[in-house]
């Protein structure tokens, strides 16, 4: 009955503070409405990074001020998190909820450790 969610163990953010990873879920049923949430876990505290509800076959729509963007293809969601700094290094968990039709299913990934390295400032040029 449990829904399995797979995501990569480790991802390195780009020098521009952008990290992308795939979140794939094994849907036990034919869901038409899915909610995907990215959570950050640090010191056993969990916070929401971003969330989007989408209809199967349609694009993911995050809120305008969200740091996340994404696309969906079948049971795969391609997530991109932007604006990351070194202090944002941590475990990012993909949570998937099959909202409709019944039954409801919850899937929690093991998390992706995202490493963010702030770029070195450019040396002053004379």
């Amino acid at each position: 009955k449990a829904m399995h969610v797979a995501q990569p163990a480790v991802v390195l953010a780009s020098s521009r503070g952008i990290a992308s990873f795939v979140c794939e879920y094994a849907s036990p049923g034919k869901a038409t409405e899915v909610r995907v949430t990215v959570l950050r876990q640090a010191d056993s505290q969990v916070t929401e990074v971003c969330a989007a509800t989408y209809m199967m076959g349609n694009e993911l729509t995050f809120l305008d001020d969200s740091i996340c963007t994404g696309t969906s293809s079948g049971n795969q969601v391609n997530l991109t998190i932007q604006g990351l700094r070194a202090m944002d290094t941590g475990l990012y968990i993909c949570k998937v909820e099959l909202m409709y039709p019944p039954p409801y299913y919850l899937g929690i990934g093991n998390g992706t450790q995202i490493y963010v390295i702030d770029p070195e400032p450019c040396p002053d040029s004379d």
Epitope: K1, A2, M3, H4, P28, E33, R35, T37, L39, V46, T47, E48, A51, T53, I93, K95, M99, Y100, P102, P103, Y104, Y105, L106, I108
Partner: antibody
Framework: QVQLVESGGGVVQPGRSLRLSCAAS????????MHWVRQAPGKGLEWVTF????????YYADSVKGRFTISRDNSKNTLYLQMNSLRAEDTAIYYC???????????WGQGTLVTVSS | EIVLTQSPGTLSLSPGERATLSCRAS???????LAWYQQKPGQAPRLLIY???SRATGIPDRFSGSGSGTDFTLTISRLEPEDFAVYYC?????????FGQGTKVEIK
């Protein structure tokens, strides 16, 4: 701090209706799914109903399907339970509960007692 | 529907003793979706353990959870006076959300 406060319980005759409320504070209400759970006197916990973030998706236990309706007003940070055609077996303490980020019910209200009796 | 069966129904122990509570599911439950709650008389339930073995905020480390598949265990390593209560397991991986019938831990 997170707080859930239920109200609206009381004594009601079989066949009548009652509406429970759960006022939420200390968190962004619209970011969480919510539940009602009940406990008959001296008995265990029974899940009653669930509502999604925006209120569009609702699930019910078979024992209340067609009689109870869950709803929420995110602008008022309030969860509701409309109970119609009440039966003696609906007598219980009714708790509202928040779904934590990882799925368990991480915060509960203090409960409100509903007694269905003639 | 996933049926959860808890055993024993009542556990009579003395303070300082170890308590082992069992929860068995009628079908496989992912360990990410199994929780334990504590309830004292006149109070609402309180989340103790989620994801089968992660302690909720503020829960002392004498409480631990284990198990996978269909068999789960809550262990209280050394019972304190405030631990005497009723304990419920719950699965939250799919609807309908279900609870076990509870195990009462009472003072011997």
């Amino acid at each position: 701090q997170v707080q859930l406060v239920e109200s609206g319980g009381g004594v009601v005759q079989p066949g009548r209706s009652l509406r429970l409320s759960c006022a939420a504070s200390g968190f962004t209400f619209s970011h969480y799914t919510m539940h009602w759970v009940r406990q008959a006197p001296g008995k265990g916990l029974e899940w009653v109903t669930f509502i999604s973030y925006d209120g569009n998706n609702k699930y019910y236990a078979d024992s209340v399907k067609g009689r109870f309706t869950i709803s929420r007003d995110n602008s008022k940070n309030t969860l509701y339970l409309q109970m119609n055609s009440l039966r003696a077996e609906d007598t219980a303490i009714y708790y509202c509960a928040r779904t934590g980020w990882l799925g368990p019910f991480d915060y509960w209200g203090q409960g409100t007692l509903v007694t269905v009796s003639s | 529907e996933i049926v959860l069966t808890q055993s024993p129904g009542t556990l009579s122990l003395s303070p300082g003793e170890r308590a082992t509570l069992s929860c068995r599911a009628s079908q496989s439950v992912g360990s990410s979706y199994l929780a334990w709650y504590q309830q004292k008389p006149g109070q609402a339930p309180r989340l103790l353990i989620y994801g089968a073995f992660s302690r909720a905020t503020g829960i002392p480390d004498r409480f631990s959870g284990s198990g996978s598949g269909t068999d789960f265990t809550l262990t209280i390593s050394r019972l304190e006076p405030e631990d005497f209560a009723v304990y419920y397991c719950q699965q939250y991986g799919s609807s309908p959300w279900t609870f076990g019938q509870g195990t009462k831990v009472e003072i011997k």
